[in-house]
Structure formats: C-alpha cells, structure tokens
Amino acid sequence: AGVFELQIHSFGPGPGPGAPRSPCSARLPCRLFFRVCLKPGLSEEAAESPCALGAALSARGPVYTEQPGAPAPDLPLPDGLLQVPFRDAWPGTFSFIIETWREELGDQIGGPAWSLLARVAGRRRLAAGGPWARDIQRAGAWELRFSYRARCEPPAVGTACTRLCRPRSAPSRCGPGLRPCAPLEDECEAPLVCRAGCSPEHGFCEQPGECRCLEGWTGPLCTVPVSTSSCLSPRGPSSATTGCLVPGPGPCDGNPCANGGSCSETPRSFECTCPRGFYGLRCEVSGVTCADGPCFNGGLCVGGADPDSAYICHCPPGFQGSNCEKRVDRCSLQPCRNGGLCLDLGHALRCRCRAGFAGPRCEHDLDDCAGRACANGGTCVEGGGAHRCSCALGFGGRDCRERADPCAARPCAHGGRCYAHFSGLVCACAPGYMGARCEFPVHPDGASALPAAPPGLRPGDPQRYL
C-alpha cells in the first residue's frame, strides 16, 4: 500500500509567441482546480476508461481576475498535493491524465460553472520510494509543470511497496535469514514467506502463504500472462496454458469497495455501488458535495447540500457514469481486429493498430520485424514492408547502436523547439501547431486536423498527444 503524490508547479502560457488569452476576466473571475486520473500499465487507454489506480481532485485555487491588457501570467494554483492512495502493489508503469478545470465565479444562475481548460496525458515508468519525477507538458498554448512520486506506507517498502519492514528487535542485527531493510537500515525485513513458487517478478504477498498477482499476470503462482482475447467466459476457461484468467477468486473477493460500498462483478472487472456521500472507483472519496464539483465533462450537479446527502450528476449527451466521467462507449463492439485500439472520434471510429498490422480495422498482417534486433533497448516498428527501430533515449541509427542526441534529428515539426528531457524529448510548438511533435495544425475555428484523437477529447479541446 502507498500513495501517489502529484504536485502542480505552474500552469500558464507556454514558451514562444501566441500567448493564450487569460481564462478569467474582470466580468468573470475564476479559479483553477485539477483532476488526476491514474491507470496501471502502459496501455494507451481511452481518456474515459476507469481510473483503475485511482483519481483525485485538488482544492480550488485562489480567485483570479485578469488585469486588462496584461498577458496571461502563470495562474494562481491550489495549495497542497493531489494524493491518490493505492491499496495493493505499485505497478511500476502507469498512465496518467491531468485535467485543468476552470470554475467561473460570475453571476451564473444555479451556481458556478465548470469547464475543462486543458488535458494532458502520458505513460510513465516510476519506482516507488524514489525522488520526485518532474515533467513539463503542453496542451495547446498552455504549459503545465508538475512532479510526482509514489511513496510506500509503512511497513511497506521497495520499488513496488511489496516488501515489509519491522523495527529491529535487537539493536545490533536482524534475525537469522533476515536482511536490513534498505533504505531503512535501522529496520529489518519482516519474515514474510509467500506461497512456494510464487513468481518473484509478477507476484507478491501481504500475508504469509499468499500469492497475489501484479496487473497482467494470473494463475496460482502468477506465472501466466493475462490475455482476454481467447477467453470464453468472463473469468476465462480453466486451462492455465491459454493465458486467460483462471476460475477462482473473483474481482469482488475481499470486497474492494470501501466505506460500505457494495461490489458487483462486471465482464472486465468490478463496480462499486457507493453509499451516500462517497464516490470513486472504490468509494474511497468521501464527503463530496456539489460545491466540490464532482461532475465532469460539463455534467450538472443537483442536490448534495451537505456531505451526508447524495448528489446526482446529470450528464450531457455522450457521457455517463455517476460523475459523467465515462464517454458512451461505441467501441464496445470491438471493431478493431488483432488487438487494435479503438478510438471514438465522435464523428467516426478509428483503429490504432498494433505493430505488424494495418488497414482500417487492422485486418492486414505485416511481418517486417521477423529476426530483426534493435540494440540498447530499442523496439522494432513494423510497417510498409520495411522495419525500423524506435530507439531508447540517447541512442539512434538504424539499429540503435549509435549514441544520439534526441533532438539531433529535429523531430519537432513546423518550427517547434526541441528540449532534451529525462523522460524523452519535449517539443515547444510554434503558434498554430500542436501534438507531441508539433505535427498537427490547429484550425482557426479551434478544431484540429488530427488523424486519431483519443476518445473523450472533443476536437478543439486543448490537449497533448504522446
């Protein structure tokens, strides 16, 4: 168990000309707040898919009124950290969405109005217990600077918060067979023995004799990779060799719903029905009223005058969920073949194909990487009858054998400025362009010519693609 912490350092105009207009005015003062959504793994999940690792909402920032004629400065931010507790092991790789919301404080009928100002997303690798990781992301003309870390809650330690430490019983040394609990040298590893044969890479235990699996692994010893494509039932067939989830403990076992929530199984996972005053994937967020702005995507909040009374979100067309956090899923028919990612663009469905597949529905099989190796952690990318290596940061060349400056290839299009950054390269786009490599022109009407915007992001939303 532990907590993911997010610190927002600044939200304001990005570098370069074309500063955005201030989101607040003398007639309509406003304040900012932030929402973070975390998902395990590196999957390119749609923006509205559940925040399976958790979500958090910041406090409201100070009220801000634009000074007439002044450029938009860095906007005043809420105090404190956004904290997302996690109950199980920290997954090590995760996806995030950070949304910047504007609360307008003018004379709106029915209270304040909320609108989404910017949304950034990314996929990161992060070990628990380390120092703050820092990031700069751009959404249209806005720039968001933030840092994050994962902390283990005692007695858990380690990069996944799965090792347990206890204070030493003797002042000088640990008991037989037990190591000092680095980095807590004055503590010792607790004598916790998992089920015999439990995979050290993919399994962990919180009780002796137990074997619990990290995301993507299953089986009694967590040695079987999960693949839902060949499963015949919600839990999958009984054969452990298929890589399907084996019958046994269900997602509701042990009731993951906190605060008296009731759990019901869904084909993919579970769903919590929360008592009054609680919400979140596991009913872990408490004391929420309409004043906290729990309805996303323009949902209208009704009721909930005090923390003990329920609120209801009336969602706009295209959204659903108790907090209007889910877009109506047109991809549920799974139109993309061969593991392709379905993207609902609003006006159309689009398939983003896995490496080695192509076509409108990923129906064409390519095999360009067979027998090819990319050095230094590079990955082979198939397509168009030829292979190329996508190289890790710091390497280049056809097979990633050459040391490289990530900015040397001038990856930022349309005059964008390139910055070498510890998590990759970052492009600061020239006015009128957006995207991870500044490859997409922004049309004057605010829509963009994106070939494949993630679902849940309407054209015209400030956004960043990774």
Epitope: Q7, H9, P131, L184, F422
Partner: antibody, heavy 121, light 107 residues
Framework: QVQLVQSGAEVKKPGASVKVSCKAS????????MHWVRQAPGQGLEWMGW????????SYAQRFLGRVTMTRDTSINTVHMELSRLGSDDTAVYYC??????????????WGQGTLVTVSS | DIQMTQSPSSLSASVGDRVTITCRAS??????LGWYQQKPGKAPKRLIY???SLQSGVPSKFSGSGSGTEFTLTISSLQPEDFATYYC?????????FGQGTKVEIK
C-alpha cells in the same frame, strides 16, 4: 548527518577511462537525485549530469553524451561516474552533489569532498 | 540550454563593505536559482536556494533576491572569511547550468 565520501585521486593516460565513486550515508539513499559536477584547474563549475538512485535513470549534459556513464549500487549506497576517452582537458576535480528534495528541480545541498583526476601521458 | 551570466567576474572590496553580485539568465527561470560559495581546495557550499531562502547555518549577512531573469546576491558587511569565489546555479531546467563565477578579493 548527511555525508558524501568520494574515492581517491586518479592519474590516467589519454584515451583511458576513469571511474569515480561516491558513497552516501545519513539519509535515505534512494530518495534523492545525485549529480556530478566538475571543475578544471582555475576554472568554474561545470554540471555533468544526474542519476536517480532508486530507478537508475540518468540525464547527461549534452557535451558528455556518449562518454559519461552514471550507475548506482543500492546495496552499498554508492553512485559511480565513469568517463571514457579521456583527454588532457578532462583534468579536473570531480564532485558528487546531492540534490535537495524540493519537488521541482532542486539545487545541491550536500557535496562530496571532490576527486582529482589527472590526465597525462 | 539556459545560459547564466554572472557579473562582475571579479571584484576587490574591503572588510565591512556591502557587496552585490548579479546573475542574469538567458530566459525566465522563475525563482529557481541557488548561490554557492567556494574557497580554494574546498567543495562549494550552498548559501541561498530558491533565489532568496537562506540555507540553514549560513549567516544572515548573506541575502538573495530576484525572479525571472535578474538575480542578486548581497553580502551586507564583508568579513575576512567571505573572500572566496561565488557561483549562481539555475535549477529551473533538468539541464543545470552555473554562472562563470565571481571572485571576491581583498582590496
């Protein structure tokens, strides 16, 4: 109290490599970035790069890319900096420095005593 | 990369003088600037962090100010132990850069 103790002075020939170590104590080693800074005789301070001791991730100054490698050994709370293809202009005192725990990029609150590396034929 | 320009490169002053050293960044760095003192044969020592915060244990005669691109380190009353070289460091960016240094000598 926080201490950073560096390995001893080295004399190397041009074209060789040198590996300098920095042993940390008095704090949670994996919780802070460690940086390397060098100073040629009579010159100013030059930042070389950092390592995250928890994950092993690194970031290097542009001019050292391809020549510098920073590693860590969490079992002995030590970071290492290896510089290859040495030239006479690499003669310098090499410092390890701990970055403070501010949540944005921090400055350096504790420094090692320095390791003199002399490159001479 | 962000360039840091320190001025003057050297100065002569007497004990009791008020001394000001300036550091200019090539682009805005908010308040992400530190000041260091280094004496011959010794490692640098942090005096100021976040532009104006005094490092614990450092005497209050040292002060820092500024934000954005212009920063100053002030020694209110120079003492014999303050004759040293002073460096600024920007930490707004992942790629840190130092100023070229200011040597404070006895007049």
């Amino acid at each position: 109290q926080v201490q950073l103790v560096q390995s001893g002075a080295e004399v190397k020939k041009p074209g060789a490599s040198v590996k300098v170590s920095c042993k940390a104590s008095g704090y949670t080693f994996t919780g802070y970035y460690m940086h390397w800074v060098r100073q040629a005789p009579g010159q100013g301070l030059e930042w070389m790069g950092w390592i995250n001791p928890n994950s092993g991730d690194t970031s290097y100054a542009q001019r050292f890319l391809g020549r510098v490698t920073m590693t860590r050994d969490t079992s002995i709370n030590t970071v290492h900096m290896e510089l290859s293809r040495l030239g006479s202009d690499d003669t310098a005192v090499y410092y390890c420095a701990r970055e403070d725990d501010s949540s944005w990029y921090g400055s350096f609150d504790y420094w090692g005593q320095g390791t003199l590396v002399t490159v001479s034929s | 990369d962000i360039q840091m320009t320190q001025s003057p490169s050297s100065l002569s002053a007497s004990v009791g003088d008020r001394v000001t050293i300036t550091c200019r960044a090539s682009q805005g760095i908010r308040n992400y600037l530190g000041w260091y003192q280094q004496k011959p044969g010794k490692a640098p020592k942090r005096l100021i962090y976040a532009a104006s915060s005094l490092q614990s244990g450092v005497p209050s005669k040292f002060s820092g100010s500024g934000s954005g691109t212009e920063f100053t380190l002030t020694i209110s009353s120079l003492q014999p132990e303050d004759f040293a070289t002073y460096y600024c460091l920007q930490h707004d960016s992942d790629l840190r850069t130092f100023g070229q240094g200011t040597k404070v000598e006895i007049k």
